[in-house]
């Protein structure tokens, strides 16, 4: 089914307008901002969600060290251009004709330029590192319990195939979730790791995109997991192209 039939809402995307005007009177939902039809049985693409958001009123070491090419989304919100499939267009420009290239999760991967800037292809983000710091608890979490709970979360809540959760690392109080998905691995119908990471980020920030509750509160074997901060690193299949000036 496309959406919840009983009251015609989109369980996986609250930033939609739904009406029973689909084939045979079925409930059909369109994303705010773009008006594109969305499949409510899975996650909506990050590009359409950002567009909707902008249109809405208002050694023994086990932790991963992000690679020198890892990107962090420092630019924040912008109103993106999405292709007909809801993916980010490789080149994004603002209203003052400043343009830049983005990766498949919409994060800038080049210096900003003008309208002459070329972005030949949409470069895929194939590795995402979600870095969480949790608040003090009654005791350290058991690593295997934590691993199982986070894998369950990504499988059940975000519908991400388990093979794309590459690892869960834990060194109290830091938790790292590694998501990996190469172009060749992603089959039709598979949730994109970028979309799953975005839904997770919004959940942690108490801004759930799912219909219903405002956020996501995790517990591991009954123990409340209260997140103190979240950092997300993005690794692309082709390293980003920034001038040396930005790196100093």
């Amino acid at each position: 089914h496309t959406a919840a039939q009983d009251n015609c809402t989109c369980p996986t995307n609250k930033m939609t307008v739904c009406s029973p005007d689909g084939p045979g009177g079925r409930c059909q939902c369109r994303a705010l901002g773009s008006g594109m039809a969305v499949d409510c049985s899975t996650l909506t693409s990050k590009c359409l969600l950002l567009k909707a958001r902008m249109s809405a009123p208002k050694n023994a070491r086990t932790l991963v060290r992000p690679s020198e090419h890892a990107l962090v989304d420092n630019d924040g919100l912008y109103d993106p251009d999405c292709d007909p499939e809801g993916r980010f267009k490789a080149r994004q420009c603002n209203q003052t004709s400043v343009c830049w290239c983005v990766n498949s999760v919409g994060v800038r991967r080049t210096d900003k330029g003008d309208l002459s800037l070329r972005c030949d292809e949409l470069v895929r983000t194939h590795h995402i590192l979600i870095d969480l710091r949790h608040r003090p608890t009654a005791g350290a979490f058991n690593h295997s319990d934590l691993d199982a709970e986070l894998r369950r979360l990504f499988r059940e809540r975000y519908r991400l195939h388990p093979k794309f959760v590459a690892a869960v690392h834990y060194e109290q109080p830091t938790i790292q979730i590694e998501l990996r998905q190469n172009t060749s691995q992603k089959a039709a119908g598979d949730v994109d790791i970028g979309d799953a990471a975005y839904y997770f980020e919004r959940d942690i920030k108490g801004e759930s995109l799912f219909q219903g509750r405002g956020g996501l509160d995790l517990r591991v074997r009954g123990e409340p997991l209260q997140v103190e901060r979240t950092l997300i690193y993005y690794l692309d299949e082709i390293p980003p192209k920034f001038s040396m000036k930005r790196l100093t």
Epitope: R135, T137, A138, G139, I204, K205, G206, E207, S208, R213, G214, G215, D217, R219, R221, G222, E223, P224, Q226, E228
Partner: antibody
Framework: QIQLVQSGPELVKPGASVKMSCKAS????????IHWVKQKPGQGLEWIGY????????KYNEKFKGKATLISDKSSTTAYMEVRGLTSEDSAVYYC????????????WGQGTSVTVSS | DIQMTQSPSSFSVSLGDSVTITCKAS??????LAWYQQKPGNAPRLLIS???SLETGVPSRFSGGGSGKEYTLSITSLQNEDVATYYC????????FGGGTKLEIK
């Protein structure tokens, strides 16, 4: 249905200790922590701490460290709180509470145990 | 520790009126906010969690709003049974309650 049933009122002398209970039923006891909350007469609510019955791990509000001790007994699905070195400041109603199934808010509450400290 | 400041501390209202209670956190609590209703001699009752989500069985005249550090509880068309003390509580960093707002009928 889910229930938290607390022990009856207590009248105790200054300097003594008191131990109250909170019997949980209607759900798997080890799946949720049990919180304890204090309410002095005519005043607001104050979080004391929680115990995780799964592993007996405890977390306390700094203010209540050394004052309250939380324990649990899986076999009887009961949580206990002992308050020691009682003074008039400890005269209050003490509630146990269980979190909501989806959030860390407190969804199910015991009826409260009234403690009066008086010589 | 996160401080929760609730205002006003008391409210005198007429039946059928609307009322809004405000709760301010000392830092961003990312919508990890609950509202409770407590009647004399009773335990608190959870009305709203996640800042806006109404719990099962809570009348629709209650609603929660806000984000960041500032949150509100609104009650429209006040009924006799709404006379109580209302508390906000943050659960982003441990658990802290606001001082309470006592609702009385004029």
């Amino acid at each position: 249905q889910i229930q938290l049933v607390q022990s009856g009122p207590e009248l105790v002398k200054p300097g003594a200790s008191v131990k109250m209970s909170c019997k949980a039923s209607g759900y798997t006891f080890t799946t949720y922590v049990i919180h304890w909350v204090k309410q002095k007469p005519g005043q607001g609510l104050e979080w004391i701490g929680y115990i995780n019955p799964n592993n007996d791990g405890t977390k306390y509000n700094e203010k209540f460290k050394g004052k309250a001790t939380l324990i649990s007994d899986k076999s009887s699905t009961t949580a206990y709180m002992e308050v020691r070195g009682l003074t008039s400041e400890d005269s209050a109603v003490y509630y146990c509470a269980r979190p909501h199934f989806e959030t860390h808010a407190m969804d199910y509450w015991g009826q409260g145990t009234s403690v009066t400290v008086s010589s | 520790d996160i401080q929760m400041t609730q205002s006003p501390s008391s409210f005198s209202v007429s039946l059928g009126d609307s009322v809004t209670i405000t709760c301010k956190a000392s830092e961003d609590i990312f919508n990890r906010l609950a509202w409770y209703q407590q009647k004399p001699g009773n335990a608190p009752r959870l009305l709203i969690s996640g800042a806006t989500s109404l719990e099962t069985g809570v009348p629709s005249r209650f609603s929660g709003g806000g984000s960041g550090k500032e949150y509100t509880l609104s009650i429209t068309s006040l009924q006799n049974e709404d006379v109580a003390t209302y508390y906000c509580q943050q659960y982003w960093n441990t658990w802290t309650f606001g001082g309470g707002t006592k609702l009385e009928i004029k």
